[in-house]
């Protein structure tokens, strides 16, 4: 592939995280070329012989693809010509974690960039009022986490309070024997207060909020991937 006299093109990647069992994206962008057949995209993984994925002359070329990625990869074909070389990875596995290289050749030049891909499990927590308990309590549940996260409670009224003495957290292994269900119960809660259940591991941080008043219960939850 002759590119004599051409320059190195800018390739940009973003560290990202994959959720085990779901589809993930390894993000990569580059200085676009105006013609599709001038673009070659290669995805490589450190420690793996063969390619993760190759796209050239407007088509996937999977002749050198490593078997662990067979049938699981795709580029966003319609976005290649505008500089998107991101790779869709189906059914993310724990073993997909590692260092990937996005290598680009165009008629304008060539370039590459690495990205760290973390894999684990993370899910949104849901908080409910547990009326079965002798005193009013809150139950925070999140179905899938890995590695094992930390769980902490906070309250709007009692800011800075340590709730570890009045809460109980358990981790239950899911059927696939990797991810775990997180359950945390907070006891002795008071009405007209907002409580937060925070679940965090080295991949993600999730927060569930609940506001309990005499007349209603309001919930909100959010999930944030770390270092991405």
């Amino acid at each position: 592939f002759g590119i004599s006299g051409k320059h190195f093109i800018t390739v940009t990647t973003f560290t990202s995280a994959g959720n085990i069992g779901e589809d993930g994206t390894l993000s990569c962008t580059f200085e676009p070329d105006i013609k599709l057949n001038g673009i070659v995209i290669q995805w490589l993984k450190e420690g793996i012989k063969g390619l993760v994925h190759e796209f050239k002359e407007g088509k996937d070329d999977l002749s050198q693809q490593h078997e662990m990625f067979r049938g699981r990869t795709a580029v966003f074909a319609d976005q290649v010509v505008v500089g998107n070389a991101s790779l869709r990875l189906k059914n993310v596995q724990l073993t997909d974690a590692g260092t990937y290289t996005c290598y680009i050749r165009t008629s304008k030049g060539k370039g590459n960039a690495n990205l760290e891909y973390k894999t684990g499990a993370f899910s949104m927590p849901e908080i409910n009022v547990d009326y079965n308990a002798s005193s009013e309590s809150l139950r925070c549940e999140a179905p899938r986490w890995f590695p094992q996260p930390t769980v902490a409670w906070a309250s709007q009224v009692d800011q800075g309070a340590n709730f570890s003495e009045v809460s109980n957290t358990s981790f239950e292994l899911n059927s696939e024997n990797v991810t775990m269900k997180v359950v945390s119960v907070l006891y002795n809660v008071t009405i007209n207060n907002t409580y937060s259940c925070m679940i965090e591991n080295d991949i993600a941080k999730a927060t569930g909020d609940i506001k309990v008043t005499d007349s209603e219960v309001k919930r909100r939850s959010q999930l944030q991937l770390l270092n991405s």
Epitope: E31, P32, I34, K35, N37, D78, V81, V82
Partner: antibody, heavy 117, light 107 residues
Amino acid sequence: QVQLVQSGAEVKKPGASVKVSCKASGYTFTSYWMHWVRQAPGQGLEWIAAIYPGNSDTDYNQKFKGKAKITAVTSTSTVYMELSSLRSEDTAVYYCTTTVAHYFDYWGQGTMVTVSS
Amino acid sequence: EIVMTQSPATLSLSPGERATLTCKASQDVSFAVAWYQQKPGQAPKLLISSASYRYTGVPDRFSGSGSGTDFTLTISSLEPEDFAVYYCQQHYNTPLTFGGGTKVEIK
């Protein structure tokens, strides 16, 4: 929102030159190719050339090499196309168009260049 | 250069009818074809990119298909505002080239 605003209509004599401008706004000017396409009266569309303002890379249709010259000024987010040695066959509407998320997804309003003695 | 041949040159149809426009490339262009609509006195508007991806805001009566050398733009049920000229364009190789256009006119 993305906008491409072109300079006004021009009337030129054969042999003269003309410089048409296209001012971009609403996106990162240096990150996307800007193209020029022309359309003679009652005719189809013809690609002339393109420029990547980030590094001034250009690509020309061989047919227009020596006829068209495109430049980009990043400080004003403006692309220029100069047409030289004008002939009556160069009478056309000249469009600038960019490729942000898809091919030619935004177009200027067009600049009519008339070449007449 | 890659030659894009559109057919028919003119299509005379009534509102509500189905329109099928074809575009043939002189060589394999993978999926690198876009379709544009142009009305008199206006700049072209992108309808379909990468052979089959409907552009934002384009009504779902417009659809594109094909790969390699044969491409089709289909308008499932013509609305009055759909009567215009349609162009296909390849961005597989330079020079980028357009088809000669198909005029969809009211019968």
